[in-house]
């Protein structure tokens, strides 16, 4: 069939079809639907709403739509035994208790199954000794502590604040500087933004609030007792002891009201300087241990979680493309929430919903797209991305020959200033064309385009006229698609102001106030935001499914390879007499970039030039844009890190929500002048520039002309 | 409307228990703590006991430690006070009070105040 034949119309026509279907009404009545109660994974509640997607979706009109099932390792509290802290006097007895659930929000009280905050996979441990504070448990903080103030966190209980980087490499960094348990917190100087009233009055945390969260290190593995296989029927199971990325101490998180009483009494050292300090009326002591008259008192932890293979449903909707069906663009995003998941996820999954209504539509009217896409509402994304990763691990042979995209489509909103992108580089383009086609929500820019909006208020800090777009790290179900399999991602959704607001997320992020009411009275009444996002999600990936050629711009890819290679450059000569001893150069990777640039460049010629009309040509060039990022998949993956294979970006080691550029040698250099034994440690950077610069110049390769 | 009403005030002898209700109607208890407070004939008011919403903490008077326990039914929106080991300087009017801070985990200021029940300890 020829592609006109395909889609039944032009695509230009198509597209405008596609977006001009999607209504904010439609969004606003979905998110009302999917956050009337709890949506916990693996519970039944969350398994009801999976048959009802898949009924749905069905009714929309897509050509099937399964259910996809594994059994997981999940993790919960105990009902009858929960979990709380305690400041414990000296002959044992309690004075203080951390509260045991949440005051629930106006309208929810007699709601049922409301999981009480806690950290999932905690283990059991009933800990007691004295507090260190260690401001956000970053690997600097740490730093701080241990080298400069010289003090020990060895057997003591340390109390962190939520912010900066993911929960769990704040968990993994107390247990490597030796603590017996984590408490983490909500400082107000982070989840409470200045001038606006907390829920239910405003968007702000109230003191009684807790952000719930995992607290693994998967470093992409899935399921932590299958790690690079689906949990299947037959599926072989570690024993716990093997489990990957497990935490080994107890942890526990708790509201500010509970910090204070906490921190209040901490005595020892003073804080080191002021980005150590809160917005608490607290001292911000360090400690260790609390001051004078309290010196006795200790604080005591009471940790019963258990740890349970759970079974978790994906739901997989089918729209089979016409030209090339064995061609497949993903959009997924979760469907599995803390609580009522008001934004995260149901603010995502409303927009999915109506973009498959849309694409529904369509195909109803007689429309298929060019390739496949495949939509998928995925389970226990909260627990360490569980059901994409199964499901990708179940499904990695056809996916890695097939899949040209995925796109997210976790939480639609987490503000309503600007827009927020982070993708790979052959997708800019595809963004920077689509939001100058897409109209602003801004007020201020009414008549005036999406991305003339975004480049106003989040400028690119290199190139002037253009948008910031960030590097995709990790924290969502892109995760497997992108590290592991090197399939092109990408994400978006509205964002705050990045520049008044400081504080880390969204202030309600994870707790029970994230309902339905805080996005309808407080972000997004019109649910215009919502619908520009799903503008931009769904029309991505109507470009991506529909496009002759492939919407990838490889040229792109080059120039972000050489800034790249010039950061990392510069990080290693900070080190210059180590580089000069060791021998350590980077002439080959600048010499793999510049080919990389100069065979993008003649690619992207013949692209220009190419027979759209044979339909041989059309695939090979198709697939050489489609293969790209594959190529920079090294099979054996990253030190350490198995399952991030991407050689060019990776999840930070420190902050597993941001993303790396040439991970390998970043880590290969952190902190390199500590190492004991620097000649190994150097030989490892060398190693490190060798496996990049090679893989740049294979992935380079891949675009010549192929005879 | 908000409001809170007292029941099972009495007289009885010293030595003997009572147990005072404090029915919440117009808001929920579950998101709040709550307080006894205790007025004896002639005198001012005197704090007698603090829960929080979530029944983790409780906080009395030193005049009545181990001998009233407060307790709440968040589910029948109630709250409880079982008073034993009664004796003649416990003899006042019985006041509930809501406490003014949504989670508050310590004993703050009142906002919402009953009408109150009495109580006589007497031979």
């Known amino acids: 069939k020829s592609s006109n034949e395909a889609t039944n119309i032009t695509p230009k026509h198509n597209m405008k079809a596609f977006l001009d279907e999607l209504k904010a009404e439609n969004i606003k009545k979905f998110l009302y639907n999917f956050t009337q109660i709890p949506h916990l994974a693996g519970t039944e509640q969350n398994f009801q709403l999976a048959k009802q997607i898949q009924s749905q979706w069905k009714e929309f009109g897509l050509d099937s739509v399964e259910l996809a099932h594994y059994d997981v390792l999940l993790s919960y509290p105990n009902k009858t035994h929960p979990n709380y802290i305690s400041i414990i006097n000296e002959d044992g007895n309690e004075i203080f208790n951390t509260s045991l659930f949440e005051p629930p929000p106006p309208g929810y009280e007699n709601v049922s199954d409301i999981v009480p905050p806690f950290s999932a996979f905690s283990p059991q441990g009933m800990p007691e000794g004295d507090l260190v504070y260690v401001n956000y448990a970053r690997t600097e903080d740490f730093f701080k502590l241990e080298r400069d103030m010289k003090i020990n966190c060895s057997g003591k209980i340390v109390i962190a604040r939520y912010g900066k980087v993911f929960r769990g490499n704040k968990v993994k960094n107390a247990q490597l500087a030796g603590a017996k348990g984590v408490i983490l917190y909500s400082d107000p100087a982070d989840y409470f933004a200045p001038g606006v009233k907390s829920y239910p009055d405003g968007w702000n945390l109230p003191g009684g609030g807790v952000q719930r969260g995992n607290i693994l290190n998967l470093n992409g593995a899935g399921d932590p007792l299958t790690p690079g296989y689906p949990a299947n029927e037959y599926a072989y199971r570690r024993g716990i002891a093997e489990a990957v990325g497990l935490p080994s101490i107890p942890v526990h998180p708790i509201g500010y009201y509970d910090a204070q009483k906490l921190l209040e009494k901490m005595g020892g050292s003073a804080p080191p300087d002021s980005s150590w300090r809160g917005s608490l009326k607290v001292p911000y002591n360090v400690g260790p241990g609390f001051t004078g008259n309290f010196s006795t008192q200790k604080v005591k932890m009471h940790i019963h979680s258990t740890n349970e293979v759970t079974r978790i449903y994906n739901v997989i909707g089918t729209l089979r493309g016409a030209v090339e069906p064995d061609r497949y663009v993903i959009l997924g995003g979760h469907r599995d929430s803390w609580v009522f998941g008001g934004i995260d996820p149901q603010s995502g999954a409303a927009v999915v919903h109506e973009i498959v209504r849309s694409f529904g539509t369509l195909k109803k009217e007689g429309w298929r797209p060019r390739r496949t896409i495949l939509f998928a509402s995925w389970d226990a994304e909260e627990f360490g991305l569980l059901g994409s990763t199964e499901w990708a691990e179940e499904n990695s042979r056809l996916l890695q020959e097939r899949g040209v995209a995925y796109i997210n489509a976790d939480s639609s909103i987490e503000g309503n200033y600007t827009l927020r992108v982070d993708c790979t580089p052959l997708m800019y383009s595809l963004v920077h064309n689509l939001t100058k086609e897409l109209k602003s929500p801004d007020e201020g820019f009414e008549g005036k385009s999406l991305y003339e909006s975004w480049t106003k208020k989040s400028p690119s800090p290199e190139f002037s006229g253009m948008p910031r777009i960030s590097k995709l790290g990790s924290g969502n179900d892109f995760e497997v698609f992108f590290q592991r399999l090197g399939i092109a991602s990408g994400r978006a959704r509205y964002t705050k102001n990045w520049e008044t607001n400081k504080f880390s997320g969204y202030p309600l992020y994870h707790s029970v106030y994230e309902t339905y009411e805080l996005v309808e009275k407080f972000y997004d009444p019109m649910f215009k935001y919502h619908l520009t996002v799903a503008q931009v999600r769904g029309g991505m990936v109507f470009e991506l499914a529909n496009s002759i050629v492939l919407p990838f711009d490889c040229r792109d890819y080059a120039v972000v390879l050489r800034k790249y290679a010039d950061k990392i450059y510069s990080i290693s000569m900070k080190h210059p007499q180590e580089m000069k001893t060791y021998s350590v150069s980077f002439d080959s990777l600048f010499s793999a970039v510049k080919n990389f640039t100069e065979i993008a460049s003649k690619f992207s010629e013949r692209l220009q030039d190419f027979d759209k009309s044979n339909p041989i040509v059309l695939r090979m060039m198709n697939d050489q844009l489609m293969f790209l990022e594959r190529a920079f998949i090294d099979p054996l993956g990253l030190p350490d890190r198995p399952f991030y294979r991407h050689v060019i970006y990776a999840p930070s080691s420190h902050n597993k929500y941001a993303g790396e550029s040439f991970p390998g040698i970043y880590d290969a250099l952190f902190d390199i002048e500590s190492k004991v034994d620097p000649s190994k440690a150097w030989g490892e950077v060398k190693r490190q520039i060798y496996v990049a610069a090679f893989t740049v110049q294979a992935a380079a390769e891949t675009l010549s002309e192929v005879a | 409307q908000v409001q809170l009403v007292e029941s099972g005030g009495g007289v009885v002898q010293p030595g003997r228990s009572l147990r005072l209700s404090c029915a919440a109607s117009g808001f929920p208890l579950i998101s709040y703590g709550m307080h006894w407070v205790r007025q004896a004939p002639g005198k001012g008011l005197e704090w007698v006991a603090f829960?929080?919403?979530?029944?983790?903490?409780?906080y009395y008077a030193d005049a009545v430690k181990g001998r009233f326990t407060i307790s709440r039914d968040n589910s029948k929106n109630t709250l409880y006070l079982q008073m034993n080991s009664l004796r003649a300087e416990d003899t006042a009017v019985y006041y509930c009070a809501r406490d003014r801070i949504v989670g508050g985990r310590v004993p703050d200021a009142f906002d919402i105040w009953g009408q109150g029940t009495m109580v006589t300890v007497s031979s």
């Open positions: 829960m929080t919403y979530d029944g983790s903490n409780r």
